[in-house]
């Protein structure tokens, strides 16, 4: 902390503008008025302030504001937001989404942050749920955003919001979350016609059910192997090879370069074997014929 | 150690560009700004401005504004100093040289990059 | 601007002896630096907040002053330090180094 000294005469700073970059740490402490520096807050922006010069003017900031900032403020920290602390933005009440994007920017093209994750924690709860124009607007910055919440936080997502989200914002969720999104996808996308309905639903497939995806295979849809590799191996394992050689269509093909990784191996295991060779693809594993098949979970639940 | 490398000698004509470059090592290159001094055949130091490496801020000498550009490149932790419309009186050393500690002087320079502007 | 005089242009001493640069700046100045350079070399920084020694620079080195008026002392000079001195305000934008003040052997 920069120690109290008097401003030397004719250092007191009238404004915030370039003359300051030549100021001591000291100097700033003494002759750069909080009140002003709060007023003129966009300006430290375009200044090649050092970081330690930065740190005094957060300092300053503090003093005056020892509850925290006010969004007036909050709006044009530029650069100094990058050094907020989660403790000092946990104090803060952000309510606009312009302020929101304004200190997103700052942090542009770098991993998200312990001060940004706490920024976006504090907006959203403020909110109250996570709404479009927020999500269109997180999902732009961190594309990973969404499947960095739990199951619990996407249920608080309204179908409605689900439109903002591309495939890329999905690459990293998990199967847990994908469960809580898919039926909201399908909510959003009710009306959408079929080959409209898949594009926009393919991404979310990996949440689907099994008889969503026997209800797909009757859609002449072509779904990729890479789409189809990413489904719930629980919901694909009933799924007949007619049923797949519908819902995959030409991609068919690709099923015995997958083989041996989940879920293609799971489901070939479940086949009887002539049904699998009518596809012509030489997938071997499948049950023999003459072979009964029991479904024991089955016999369990009805005992 | 602090090394601050530029790129070598430069011969230009009147009115075009010329671009500086100055690599640093040595330390965390977003942590201390980086200035520009140019030095005239005999002549003195003449600070020409300033850049902030981690936000690409800047602070240029009145006399060289509209003409001077410094830009920085983290990835490679190169500043750039870019001076167009150049005329005779701009034949000069340029020196990178590293802000210290609290405005503690220029204790790193770089070994200059000597301009001629010549038709 | 700030303007910063050095003087005098030329000091011829011998080694040995105490030399004494000054500079004046046209306007109060809260810091002065201080730097050495010869001939195709880059400037080295000496002295650093008026009166603190940088890195690696001999205790023969010494700053004073404050205000308009400082000052660079050179206790018993050594035949490496005969070189150009210029002394820099740290105090407004721009700044400004004073026109040199070269330092030869008599």
């Known amino acids: 902390e920069v120690e109290k000294t008097a401003c030397p005469s004719g250092k007191k700073a009238r404004e915030i503008d370039e003359s300051l970059i030549f100021y001591k740490k000291w100097e700033l402490e003494a002759c750069v008025d909080a009140a002003l520096l709060a007023t003129q807050m966009d300006r430290v922006n375009a200044i090649p302030f050092t970081y330690e010069q930065l740190d005094v003017l957060k300092h300053k900031l503090d003093e005056l504001y020892p509850q925290g900032y006010p969004e007036s403020v909050i709006q044009h920290l530029g650069y100094l937001f990058l050094k907020m602390s989660p403790e000092d933005i946990r104090k803060w009440n952000v309510t606009s989404l312009e302020t929101l994007k304004a200190l997103l920017e700052v942090n542009k093209g770098h991993e998200m942050s312990p001060q940004v994750a706490t920024l976006i924690d504090r907006f959203v709860k403020g909110r109250g749920q996570l709404d479009k124009d927020t999500l269109d607007t997180l999902t732009a910055f961190y594309p990973g955003y969404l499947c960095s919440l739990s199951p619990e936080e996407l249920s608080s997502v309204p179908p409605s919001s689900i439109w903002a989200v591309r495939p890329q914002d999905l690459d990293t969720c998990d199967p847990r979350q994908l469960d809580v999104l898919y039926p909201k996808a399908r909510l959003a996308f009710q009306n959408m016609n079929g080959s409209e309905y898949f594009v926009k639903i393919q991404s979310f497939l990996g949440g689907a059910p099994t008889e969503d995806l026997k209800a797909l295979s009757q859609q002449n849809v072509s779904m990729d192997l890479a789409t189809f590799m990413k489904l719930r191996t629980d919901a694909v394992l009933p799924l007949t090879v007619a049923e797949v050689q519908k819902l995959l269509g030409p991609h068919v093909e690709g099923l015995k370069a997958e083989e041996r990784h989940r879920p293609v191996r799971d489901w070939i295991l479940r086949q009887r074997q002539d049904d699998l060779d009518t596809l012509g693809l030489g997938l071997q594993g499948g049950i023999p014929n003459g072979y009964l098949v029991l479904d024991l979970s089955m016999q369990e639940a009805l005992s | 150690q602090v090394q601050l490398v530029q790129s070598g000698a430069e011969v230009k004509k009147p009115g075009a560009s010329v671009k500086v470059s100055c690599k640093a090592s040595g330390y965390t290159f977003t942590d201390y700004n980086m200035n520009w001094v140019r030095q005239a055949p005999g002549q003195g130091l003449e600070w020409m401005g300033v850049i902030n490496p981690n936000y690409g801020t800047t602070s240029y000498n009145q006399k060289f504004k509209g003409r001077v550009t410094m830009t920085r490149d983290t990835s490679t932790s190169t500043v750039y100093m870019e001076l167009s419309s150049l005329r005779s009186e701009d034949t000069a050393v340029y020196y990178c040289?590293?802000?210290?500690?609290?405005?503690?002087?220029?204790?790193?320079w770089g070994q200059g990059t000597l301009v001629t502007v010549s038709s | 601007e700030i303007v910063l005089t050095q003087s005098p242009a030329t000091l011829s001493l011998s080694p040995g002896e105490r030399a004494t640069l000054s500079c004046s700046a046209s306007?109060?100045?809260?810091?002065m630096h201080w730097y050495q350079q010869k001939p195709g070399q880059a400037p080295r920084l000496l002295i650093y907040?008026?009166?603190k020694l940088a890195s690696g620079i001999p205790a023969r080195f010494s700053g004073s002053g404050s205000g308009t008026d400082f000052t660079l002392t050179i206790s018993s000079l050594e035949p490496e330090d005969f070189a150009v001195y210029y002394c820099q305000q740290w105090s407004s934008n721009p700044l400004t180094f004073g026109q040199g003040t070269k330092l030869e052997i008599k």
């Open positions: 907040d008026t009166s």
């Open positions: 040289a590293r802000g210290d500690y609290d405005g503690a002087g220029f204790a790193y």
């Open positions: 306007s109060s100045v809260s810091y």
